[in-house]
């Protein structure tokens, strides 16, 4: 999906109002310095591409993020403010359904959500030069 035509300011507002709080809740009890950010993005569409991938695609050691509260609200925001987004996700979601498990908060998942927090922070500061 090409995120170029999304309403970035509305997605940012939804992130600041609620998604960010859900990410913090997920990470509660974890030190903010515990994980190094290794995933980066260069502009808002790229950030949303990376956010979508980390949130919804199962990875080795962490298959459960797509069923978390922050994921549900992220999906809602992308569907509402990125034209055509919900239609493009049908095959991807159905392919993943069998692999998903609920509420297994592994260290790998915590690391992945830490990366997500970094991507969202970067998304919120689009004018910063890529480091």
């Amino acid at each position: 999906y090409d995120f170029t035509n999304c309403d970035f300011e509305k997605i940012k507002a939804a992130y600041l109002s609620t998604i960010s709080k859900d990410l913090i809740t997920y990470m509660s009890g974890t030190k903010s310095t515990e994980f190094n950010n290794t995933v980066s993005c260069s502009n808002r569409p790229h950030c949303l591409t990376e956010i979508q991938s980390l949130t919804f695609n199962p990875t080795a050691g962490c298959a459960s993020l797509a069923k978390e509260m922050f994921a549900m609200k992220t999906k809602a925001a992308l569907a509402i403010w990125c034209p055509g987004y919900s239609e493009t996700q049908i095959n991807a979601t159905q392919a993943m359904k069998k692999r998903r498990k609920r509420k297994v908060t592994t260290n790998k998942c915590l690391e992945q959500v830490s990366q997500l927090q970094g991507l969202w922070r970067r998304f919120n500061r689009p004018l910063l030069k890529q480091q």
Partner: antibody, heavy 121, light 108 residues
Framework: QVQLQQSGAELVRPGSSVKISCKAS????????MNWVKQRPGQGLEWIGQ????????NYNGKFKGKATLTADKSSSTAYMQLSSLTSEDSAVYFC??????????????WGQGTSVTVSS | EIVLTQSPALMAASPGEKVTITCSVS???????LHWYQQKSETSPKPWIY???TLASGVPVRFSGSGSGTSYSLTISSMEAEDAATYYC?????????FGAGTKLELK
Amino acid sequence: QVQLQQSGAELVRPGSSVKISCKASGYAFSSYWMNWVKQRPGQGLEWIGQIFPGDGETNYNGKFKGKATLTADKSSSTAYMQLSSLTSEDSAVYFCARGGYVNFLYAMDYWGQGTSVTVSS
Amino acid sequence: EIVLTQSPALMAASPGEKVTITCSVSSSISSSNLHWYQQKSETSPKPWIYGTSTLASGVPVRFSGSGSGTSYSLTISSMEAEDAATYYCQQWSSYPLTFGAGTKLELK
């Protein structure tokens, strides 16, 4: 304007199944989570689960897994809930409610009028 | 599962009286995830207060909401007849979504 129109009251036999509907209009049906909520007579509200019509993804309250099955038909902008193996405990009013961002806060912002299900022999 | 405990379960207030309904949450949640709904008999619930303190469209300004962490409240500064209803708090912080048992507010 956003509207959620639910199907009419149902009188069903114990052990049978029932499928109730919620027809949405006034918004992009595929892009919003649809929730279902149960209310027994004189009681409070209980969340059953939700479905994302765009891809059919569901989240259920564990208490209703095996009891409720949520589906959606994008072509008719209609969400469905099937209740199986009905008992008197399932006699209730069932609401559909859209999940949406209001002032960028996420909540159930529009509700259907409710469908009454009575289980009786 | 997050449990929401409302108090009182039932109360009566005279016109002009100040009313406070509380919602205690079993584990701390973000204030953005605590909502209130109003329900009158035989009708569907209506969104009333979003994210602890944001009034839904059309809600009179005599209503207000406050709280954080595990303690939230809905206040009516001056009770009016049309405020008689049942009020539910609800959390959207973790699955399963849960509601308080409700507070039935009657006119004295």
